[in-house]
Amino acid sequence: EKSDLRTVAPASSLNVRFDSRTMNLSWDCQENTTFSKCFLTDKKNRVVEPRLSNNECSCTFREICLHEGVTFEVHVNTSQRGFQQKLLYPNSGREGTAAQNFSCFIYNADLMNCTWARGPTAPRDVQYFLYIRNSKRRREIRCPYYIQDSGTHVGCHLDNLSGLTSRNYFLVNGTSREIGIQFFDSLLDTKKIERFNPPSNVTVRCNTTHCLVRWKQPRTYQKLSYLDFQYQLDVHRKNTQPGTENLLINVSGDLENRYNFPSSEPRAKHSVKIRAADVRILNWSSWSEAIEFGSDDG
């Protein structure tokens, strides 16, 4: 990464260094240390203070974005004296060259697309590269298949999400022969970016007085159980006047997903379709194929 690290320190320096790959801030251990503390301050003056590592000469920042530029700071007291050192971590490169409008979505339970746009001041020869790191194993995933626009990478397709965890760090680096390109980084929750498939195996069975709709929960990337789903059923009478309201029914997920409703014979032609969402987020899937029941002469 082409980011300058500038140190602001008194004469006897702690030699503070930051590894953006591991998000680890470290410094030279001092003899007879009685107190040590590390933190960062971002451009909005928010302070993040992680736990110190056991050796007390390093700390790891778990969930931070760096593209707006941050300042790291280390305070160490020994039995003899106190040390303080700042480390500026700017996003070097020309302003406006970083990838922008970055977004990702998971679909079909095991595929992910990420897209971005080239920075407005990026030169013609700019090339972007996406790296993803999960929160648990700190494993780095490099984009396996880039989506291109006139030779420039403007997206990424992943068909193997096994390296992801519930929260992941996305980094888009840029290169150019002409000028330095700024980076863009983002933290994304898989549960917030997943688009569910509609429910499957939708069936309707009717007797003389009622109709029973059954369906199966969609397969998802996230590990969800049946109570984690919310469903909406659209029961629609065919050949009604335009502007007639559809009946939208909310149904909580259950071990056996079913909805029983009164509908007596003779029964006009109806259609039913279903969509699904995570009960906590209500990011609705597309509708399932409409299933028809009843008859035209009902």
Partner: antibody, heavy 120, light 111 residues
Framework: QVQLVQSGAEVKKPGASVKVSCKIS????????IHWVRQTPTKGFEWMGG????????VYAQRFQGRVTMTEDTSIDTAYLTLSSLRSDDTAVYYC?????????????WGKGTMVTVSS | QAVLTQPSSVSGAPGQRVTISCTGS?????????VSWYQQLPGTAPKLLIY???KRPSGVPDRFSASKSGTSASLAITGLQADDEADYYC???????????FGGGTKVTVL
């Protein structure tokens, strides 16, 4: 309707092992996450372990590690709990349950419980 | 000692409203992990009353409601009935210990 039918009460001597079964009817065990929880008058409810889909394996509470084994026979839709090196404070009602939500882990269906008494 | 703290008992007259508190810490309820509530009638297995902090499974009457704020949660029973007399337990997940944790239980008595 889903039901969890547990094996009958057991009386065991300290140091022995006990195996409790939990038969699922009305649904396929392979599609479910089964967990085991025990209840004592003194300690209340204690979670022992169960299938974690995130790890894709059965995980155990640290305090039972090494003494507890949870297995599943999906061909007969039955889950098993084996607890070894029994002590008197293992006297409890042991429940199997189905996880209805993985967000915070909510146990939706429960077996009726199996009373295990450890006494010399 | 239960990880989540509940009052040992609460009581109310029929028709009244009672609330049960459940206090945790920053590694469970405040982490934030979802809270579930269970009702246990004497001699029976627990029954899920609330999941996802405030959602009721089908079949649970809307007299039961719950909420969560910070490191604590609460369950409210309105229009108290004789058959609400039972033990009530809260439950969540604790990231520090990596285990599912329960409250010590609250006995609800209908006067």
């Amino acid at each position: 309707q889903v039901q969890l039918v547990q094996s009958g009460a057991e009386v065991k001597k300290p140091g022995a092992s006990v195996k409790v079964s939990c038969k699922i009817s009305g649904h396929s065990l392979s599609e479910l996450s089964i967990h085991w929880v025990r209840q004592t008058p003194t300690k209340g409810f204690e979670w022992m372990g169960g299938f974690d889909p995130e790890e894709n394996e059965i995980v155990y509470a640290q305090r039972f590690q090494g003494r507890v084994t949870m297995t599943e026979d999906t061909s007969i839709d039955t889950a098993y709990l084996t607890l070894s090196s029994l002590r008197s404070d293992d006297t409890a009602v042991y429940y199997c349950s189905i996880v209805g939500s993985f967000s915070g882990w909510a146990f939706d269906y429960w077996g009726k419980g199996t009373m295990v008494t450890v006494s010399s | 000692q239960a990880v989540l703290t509940q009052p040992s008992s609460v009581s109310g007259a029929p028709g009244q409203r009672v609330t049960i508190s459940c206090t945790g810490s920053g590694s469970n309820i405040g982490a934030p992990y979802d809270v579930s509530w269970y009702q246990q009638l004497p001699g029976t297995a627990p029954k899920l009353l609330i999941y996802h902090n405030n959602k009721r499974p089908s079949g649970v009457p809307d007299r039961f409601s719950a909420s969560k704020s910070g490191t604590s949660a609460s369950l409210a029973i309105t229009g108290l009935q004789a058959d609400d007399e039972a033990d009530y337990y809260c439950q969540s997940y604790d990231s520090r210990t990596g285990i599912i944790v329960f409250g010590g239980g609250t006995k609800v008595t209908v006067l």
